[in-house]
């Protein structure tokens, strides 16, 4: 089970002093920002028990493995469900604490009820302040049952839940009708997924026999030990005031664990610390009782005395839970409750025993989970004990489980079970990622998802040029940092692989899949300069540039021209893919725009230094075309043109330009300016008689605008040849009057 404890400080005289602390004993717990462990989360869960909104609670992190919730301003802030989430991946675990108001109408006799599948659970709500109305029971916030107030037995309302199943788990409450929900008695029911003493997917496996009130986890068969006890079977008491799976945590304050409720992963639930009992965990155990909630009885024999924290303290010459074992009986000494080895290793396991008669090498044996018995290969005999050493054959995954060291002499026998975890060395599932590259170095992220078991202790990066038979270069790196491979060859492909290791002998995993990473080519060093440019239209610009002359071949693949439109905050890039090019035509630019222009040489993906910038102003585009152009012959040498002004003008028209061309003629057209822009009519004179002409016109503001539609008209016939067309302009009405 995950080593996660939620502590509630129940000294309730002042809610502002109340706090909840979540402590994780997991390696790397709560580091959050790195890839190895999500942070501890501690929060109030308002989904079932809703309380009036108050100021937000304050969350304080104390190092990587502890988080504390404070800021409770009134007693009602405390009522309800709190949860702490810790552990990574599949081991992510939620620990739940249910807080009842000490002033509620109904109070739970016992808040947490852990029962086995198929059992009958009985929840008991004690009357604290009587009301003569129905009592409503709810399950996870939904109506469940009603009791008449007359149905109280001994001042308690009982809810019997026969044949409970795992879905029955959750938060139960008992409330008087019309009473505030805050006056309810809140309970937590935990239903193990198996019957008593069983665990596993089909509940086929037998629990190890958890001692001192430990509860067998229905998924993994491990004992979840009460606070203050440790060991595979919770057989060992911690020193007073200590808790955690290895007794590594210490209760805060001078009064030790007094006034603290401890909540552990399901199926344990919550209890007082060892040596304490009562609704607020402030009462010491009565004589003869010990452990969490003082639920255990000492029953010491042979002159043993009862310690409320650890149970029987035996006089010399005796040992055992009740001091029932004579020291003459052999005894296994100081056996670790849990050992961890890597797959396919051949570890040595030591088992020490004492007794009278003295144990010898052949009297100590090691039994694997599959029943195989190993005999020790050597023994170290000391005055007070014999230590047998066992050479374990190559470990396989099936060796995970409970092993047993057994000693047998004529004085009797003793055995000690301990858990062996066979861990699979980590193997990367993916290749490392290339972050950035230069001509002589690659920056690589070595951290990838992996199969097998963590934690990752070291990361090795192996690399060598592609298709090379030379030895691999290896760099050992910190798991959480990116790696820079240096002193590489430019424009070269490298094969790069990751190898992960976990702690312990044989913890190195197989190499991960290779990936090809290629260094960049050399950076281009030459700086071009702009020779000149000229505008070829309102949206076209021709640019030319030069490069300094240097000996040797040119390092570059082409040029990049950059135009920056500062007004709009837009950049236009034009790629010239020949290193020999020294000119380029830029089209599709925005008329009337002020551009900053520069050019730089590129090689592969690398850019050389940019030329000093030039500033270019494109002329603005002209106005829209004049509308409804019409031609009307007046004589054998005159044609009158009429039109309407363009719409949506960006400014005042400076002039109109008329284009005149003989229809079907091969010569250049003639352009005639109409310098009075307010006119909407003009007469073109000096035309040839009986000749078909094409006309179109455009307006000019700062630049020339779009051409109008083209119109055709023929002069009248008299056979005379004119000198050439000229124009006369007047108001349209005047022309019509004539």
């Amino acid at each position: 089970a995950v080593d996660l404890t939620l502590l509630a400080n129940l000294r309730l005289t002042d809610p502002q002093r109340f706090f909840l602390t979540c402590v994780s004993g997991e390696a790397g717990a709560g580091r959050g920002s790195d890839a190895w462990g999500p942070p501890l989360l501690l929060e109030k869960d308002d989904r079932i028990v809703r309380t009036p909104p108050g100021p937000p609670l304050r969350l304080a992190r104390n190092g990587s493995h502890q988080v504390t919730l404070r800021g409770f301003s009134k007693p009602s802030d405390l009522v309800g469900v709190f949860s702490c989430v810790g552990g990574a991946g599949a081991r992510r675990t939620r620990v739940i604490y249910v807080h009842n108001s000490p002033g509620a109408h109904l109070l739970p006799d016992k808040v947490t009820h852990t029962v086995n599948k198929g059992d009958t659970a009985v929840l008991s709500a004690r009357v604290h302040k009587e009301k003569q109305t129905d009592v409503i029971w709810k399950s996870n916030g939904s109506y469940f049952y009603t009791l008449d107030w007359h149905e109280a037995q001994d001042g308690r309302f009982l809810l019997q839940l026969p044949n409970v199943q795992p879905p029955s788990s959750g938060i139960y409450s008992a409330t008087y009708l019309e009473a505030s929900p805050l006056g309810s008695a809140f309970f937590r029911l935990i239903v193990r997924g198996c019957g008593a003493g069983r665990w596993g997917p089909g509940c086929t496996k037998e629990c190890p026999g958890c001692l001192h009130g430990g509860v067998c986890h229905d998924h993994d068969g491990e004992c979840v030990c009460p606070p203050g006890f440790t060991g595979t079977r919770c057989e060992q008491a911690c020193r007073e005031g200590r808790f955690g799976q290895s007794c590594q945590e210490q209760c805060p304050g001078i009064s030790g664990c007094r006034g603290l409720t401890f909540c552990l992963p399901d199926p344990y639930g919550c209890s007082c610390g060892s040596g304490w009992r009562g609704s607020q965990c402030q009462e010491a155990c009565a004589p003869g009782h010990f452990g969490a909630d003082c639920r255990l009885q000492c029953q010491c024999q042979n002159g043993g005395t009862c310690d409320r924290f650890s149970g029987c303290v035996c006089p010399s010459g005796w040992h055992g839970v009740h001091c029932e074992k004579s020291d003459r009986i052999p005894q296994i000494l100081n056996m670790a409750s849990e050992l961890e080895f890597n797959l396919e290793t051949m570890p040595r396991i030591n088992c020490a025993a004492a007794g009278n008669p003295f144990p010898v090498r052949g009297s100590i044996e090691l039994r694997k989970p599959d029943g195989t018995v190993l005999l020790s290969t050597k023994a170290i005999v000391e005055p007070e004990k014999t230590t047998a050493e066992f050479e374990v054959p190559r470990l396989v995954l099936a060796d995970s489980g409970f092993w047993e060291c057994r000693v047998s002499t004529s004085g009797g026998q003793d055995s000690r079970r301990f858990k062996v975890n066979v861990k699979v060395p980590p193997v990367p599932l993916a290749a490392p990622r290339l972050l950035t590259k230069q001509s002589r170095q690659l920056v690589v992220s070595p951290l990838v998802s992996f199969s097998g078991d963590g934690p990752i202790s070291t990361v090795r990066l192996h690399y060598r040029p592609q298709d090379s038979t030379m030895d691999w270069s290896t760099i050992v790196v910190d798991p959480s940092e990116n790696v820079t491979l240096m002193n590489l060859r430019p424009k070269t492909g490298y094969s790069v692989r990751v190898q992960l290791s976990r702690p312990g002998e044989g913890g190195e995993g197989a190499w991960g899949p290779p990936t090809l990473m290629t260094t960049d080519c050399p950076e281009p060093l030459l700086q071009p300069w702009l020779e000149g440019w000229h505008v070829e239209g309102t949206d076209r610009l021709r640019v030319s540039w030069s490069l300094p002359l240097v000996p040797g071949p040119l390092v570059g693949d082409g040029f990049l021209l950059r135009l920056w439109d500062g007004t709009r905050g837009q950049e236009r890039r034009e790629n010239v893919s020949s290193p020999q090019a020294r000119t380029a035509l830029l089209t599709g630019l925005t008329p009337g725009t002020h551009y900053q222009l520069d050019v730089q040489l590129y090689h592969c993906t690398l850019l050389g230094p940019a030329s000093p910038p030039a500033h270019v102003l494109l002329p603005p585009s002209g106005p829209p075309a004049p509308r409804h152009l019409h031609a009307q012959a007046l004589s054998d040498s005159e044609i009158q043109l009429t039109w309407k002004h363009p719409e949506a003008l960006p400014g005042p028209i400076s002039k109109y330009v008329v284009e005149v061309q003989v229809a079907g003629g091969a010569g250049d057209p003639l352009w005639i300016d109409v310098d009075r822009p307010e006119e909407t009519s003009t007469i073109i004179r000096g035309l040839n008689a009986s000749t078909r002409y094409l006309f179109r016109m455009r307006a000019s503001i700062q630049g020339l605008g779009d051409w109008s539609n083209t119109v055709e008209e023929s002069t009248l016939g008299n056979g005379l040849q004119a000198e050439g067309p000229v124009q006369e302009s007047r108001a349209a009405e005047e022309g019509l009057d004539q």
Epitope: T146, D148, E178
Partner: antibody, heavy 119, light 109 residues
């Protein structure tokens, strides 16, 4: 869907007995209070009797106390009303209704069964 | 256990509002906020239209509204429609079980 179906009504002579049943479905019968309500022809509704989920607590209107007995069989999802010493004024349509639990109101009703006490 | 007092009948024109009162004692209406109202058509079972004094079950028109003051609860039907013509009963929790009103016939003119 919650359904309540009454049965057992009919014609009975004064002083006689009758047992009404109410078959419940569509909800967890063993969790809810149940009640009987009656309505004499052309008259209003009158609460007759009620029983808590466990069957351990019951209540009766003064007009039927000592003559009527309410009971339930949670294994059969059925509510009963045993009516003894019937009188002409017990003539009515008898409805079985479910108490809403945390909604404190008879929320679902059966269609009723008619009991006629007449000689 | 005496029944709650309601007017024998009330009437109103189409589109008008009518209010039905329901008077109890300090042991029922005055003590608990568990007053409900039922609509009953002839020959049919009662249908719940208001519970907990003011709350409407889903599917019940928002033209029906409930209120309570002291020992008296009220049901208001606004925008009276032809289908509202029925008998209406109030009901109050009275500790353990219930007491019903005498019933009010609503006529739509």
């Amino acid at each position: 869907e919650v359904q309540l179906l009454e049965s057992g009504g009919g014609l009975v002579q004064p002083g006689g007995s009758l047992r009404l049943s109410c078959a419940a479905s569509g909800f967890t019968f063993s969790s809810y209070k149940m009640i009987w309500v009656r309505q004499a022809p052309g008259k209003g509704l009158e609460w007759v009797s009620g029983i808590y989920p466990s069957g351990g607590a019951t209540g009766y209107a003064d007009s039927v106390k000592g003559r009527f007995t309410i009971s339930r069989d949670n294994s059969k999802n059925t509510l009963y009303l045993q009516m003894n010493s019937l009188r002409a004024e017990d003539t009515a349509t008898y409805y079985c209704a479910r108490d809403g639990g945390d909604i404190v109101v008879p929320d679902y009703w059966g269609q009723g069964t008619l009991v006629t006490v007449s000689s | 256990q005496s029944e709650l007092t309601q007017p024998r009948s009330v009437s109103g024109s189409l589109g008008q509002s009518v209010t039905i009162s329901c008077t109890g004692t300090t042991s029922d209406v005055g003590r608990y906020n568990f007053v409900s109202w039922y609509q009953q058509y002839p020959g049919r079972a009662p249908k719940l239209i208001i519970h907990d004094v003011t709350r409407r079950p889903s599917g019940v028109s928002d033209r029906f509204s409930g209120s309570k003051s002291g020992n008296t609860a009220s049901l208001t039907i606004s925008g009276l429609q032809a289908e509202d013509e029925a008998d209406y009963y109030c009901c109050s929790y009275a500790g353990s079980f219930y007491v019903f009103g005498s019933g009010t016939q609503v006529t739509v003119l």
